[in-house]
């Protein structure tokens, strides 16, 4: 399986959200910072963020070139040895989300709540619709908190 160890500060674990068609990593030597061992194949140089290996590294030391990830569909935000980029997140409108920042080759999509939706957790995977008040509003709905409604029969000063 893909190792959960990081090789060094610049080269991170590639077992990440949406990483496509990855080669299984069988061994990772944390002392060995020159490369990564893939099924008897050895990569010496990682690809920078936004790029991937054009193909898997070979046992004879042939080092594939790095090629760009597909803009708007894939990304890698760290240096890595994989021949595939990660899949960009979709901001699912069915979960009350919309795109805040589009996916680039080096950064995953950033989502936010759609208008009239809110989310009160730190990481928003789902936003809920703001409550509609029948008897008036105490506090408007924001991106991070629901509407506060007046109770029936309450007076406004």
């Amino acid at each position: 399986r893909l190792s959960s160890k990081s090789v060094n500060a610049q080269v991170t674990d590639i077992n990440s959200k949406g990483l496509e068609l990855r080669k299984t990593v069988t061994t990772v030597e944390t002392q060995n910072l020159e490369g990564l061992h893939h099924d008897g194949q050895f990569c010496h140089k990682p690809c920078p963020p936004g790029e991937r290996k054009a193909r898997d590294c070979t046992v004879n030391g042939d080092e594939p070139d790095c090629v760009p990830c597909q803009e708007g569909k894939e990304y890698t935000d760290k240096a890595h040895f994989s021949s595939k980029c990660r899949r960009c997140r979709l901001c699912d409108e069915g979960h009350g989300l919309e795109v805040e920042i589009n996916c680039t080759r080096t950064q995953n999509t950033k989502c936010r709540c759609k208008p009239n939706f809110f989310c009160n957790s730190t990481v928003c995977e789902h936003c809920d619709p703001c409550t509609k008040c029948e008897h008036g509003i105490i506090k408007e709905c924001t991106l991070t908190s629901n509407t506060k409604c007046k109770e029936e029969g309450s007076r406004s000063n």
Partner: antibody, heavy 121, light 111 residues
Framework: QVQLVQSGAEVKKPGASVKVSCKAS????????MQWVKQAPGQGLEWMGE????????NYNQKFKGKATLTVDTSTSTAYMELSSLRSEDTAVYYC??????????????WGQGTLVTVSS | DIVLTQSPSSLSASVGDRVTITCKAS??????????MNWYQQKPGKAPKLLIY???NLESGVPSRFSGSGSGTDFTLTISSLQPEDFATYYC?????????FGQGTKVEIK
Amino acid sequence: QVQLVQSGAEVKKPGASVKVSCKASGYTFTSYWMQWVKQAPGQGLEWMGEIDPSDSYTNYNQKFKGKATLTVDTSTSTAYMELSSLRSEDTAVYYCARNRDYSNNWYFDVWGQGTLVTVSS
Amino acid sequence: DIVLTQSPSSLSASVGDRVTITCKASQSVDYDGDSYMNWYQQKPGKAPKLLIYAASNLESGVPSRFSGSGSGTDFTLTISSLQPEDFATYYCQQSNEDPRTFGQGTKVEIK
């Protein structure tokens, strides 16, 4: 309500091609990727590939590259899956399914009723 | 490819029984605390139906007797009290890595 309606069963000869349609309704077609899944008789489910209807970007399971071609017609909210050079092992029920994303976990929430493709000489 | 192995392949149970189906992945389908595992139900001649997404989230409209749990390589679908309409085949599916793969299915039959 959200619905995916697929075209009817097809019987084809080996070597022929077939195009299965999947008409979406009840949601914004271009907002959700469409997935395609194969189920051979008495067998399990096999993911074939996906298409983003907003720009026709496709991503295939390597096993189906060259076998399946995914397209969309946004004017009619219809997705298509064409199978070429048909062989007996392509005999299966083919499903389209709407893709959803929960923090990069992609899953299939609404499925078409399936289209049986039979390849027989 | 990630191989998903479901167990048992089939089981016989009675209405009211608690049923547990397991799905074991050949490598972890987790990242950053999230598990990329989904569960579907399929009845003969019908399309699959989503039950659980992201390991433990119940799909809207699915009865609360269905629940999902697990992380890493080991996942479980539980039906707390089996109902007549629950006799079907159940599939797990991972979306952490392409190609997305399904388990071979678990057939739940009437005892």
